[in-house]
Amino acid sequence: QGWQAFKNDATEIIPELGEYPEPPPELENNKTMNRAENGGRPPHHPFETKDVSEYSCRELHFTRYVTDGQCRSAKPVTELVCSGQCGPARLLPNAIGRGKWWRPSGPDFRCIPDRYRAQRVQLLCPGGAAPRARKVRLVASCKCKRLTRFHNQSELKDFGPEAARPQKGRKPRPRARGAKANQAELENAY
């Protein structure tokens, strides 16, 4: 896509581990869990432990210009790249995305995109060509997700914007579903 990196920094996502244990599969797939009726899926916190500081899923914040052919966004956009092992923080090396699984004999967890958002961008084109308007899909948040089978070290890669398409960022909605109503409330609940 011809991205130009502008700036980046990292944030560690530390799940609130004791509060929301991972729901059993039958609950996650429960037919009543549709987004419009129940305001979205339950929070995804897959670990049950007392030591919150032991787990880490990093959100790397990248500020970049978006390009489309010869055209470039008028302003940079900020997006996330998900990285980290979702294992004990003490086992995470300095080089993000490298290292060993924290619990190789047990279930594996991975830091992957959770939600995405769409952002309007205006693209400026050279030679006096008319500007373009596009909507770009950006990763909005990351989560630790249980992998269904063991992945060995050689398969590990950071999850960047092209690596996986996350689910859309459904915000919790009030029961009376309105047309962009209660926006401030929704922003606070995100």
Partner: antibody, heavy 121, light 109 residues
Framework: EVQLVQSGAEVKKPGASVKVSCKVS????????MHWVRQAPGKGLEWMGG????????IYAQKFQGRVTMTEDTSTDTAYMELSSLRSEDTAVYYC??????????????WGQGTLVTVSS | QAVVTQEPSLTVSPGGTVTLTCGSS?????????PYWFQQKPGQAPRTLIS???DKHSWTPARFSGSLLGGKAALTLSGAQPEDEAEYYC?????????FGGGTKLTVL
Amino acid sequence: EVQLVQSGAEVKKPGASVKVSCKVSGYTLTELSMHWVRQAPGKGLEWMGGFDPEDGETIYAQKFQGRVTMTEDTSTDTAYMELSSLRSEDTAVYYCATDTVGYWEKFFQHWGQGTLVTVSS
Amino acid sequence: QAVVTQEPSLTVSPGGTVTLTCGSSTGTVTIDHYPYWFQQKPGQAPRTLISDTDDKHSWTPARFSGSLLGGKAALTLSGAQPEDEAEYYCLLDYGGRFVFGGGTKLTVL
């Protein structure tokens, strides 16, 4: 490739409700932004509502506000559009349509085959 | 709610050029309305020809192009073919709410 398969034709009485389903295959429903469009016989297309990924919420056309409910069952990758208090002018073909799965957000790229809803006493 | 206007009908000769337009009751149509153009043939679901003013899709024939023209969105068909006879709809984005135009019936003869 995204494919959308809608439920079969329905005949309803005025005042009743109808629930049309749209089954997604090729991708999961959470990866897509689903919209609903209807077309009365011999008339044009009319947007009813859909998911807005900018705000992360489902929004409805003012005309249908309070009468339409769009829901999704992620366990079966099926979207639903329920329209209540039906009247004869709601007789139309109802389409579901989704965006494309790619870097740029493009809506209405894939369409269901349409569901004819007839409202008649 | 905004009203989106299109020519009710247009006729073009085979091989000829025709431009369909799409106006907004709120004023000038801009790139920030992300204009879409759809083609619909009798008994079929619509299909997208153009997104975001001028962005063609893999299935869009090269003879179709989108632009802004005189404060309206425009769909230009250059070198019309008999199979282009259809109803054409534009769609404008008003901050996440969409409004279709009334459609243009294009006849190729």
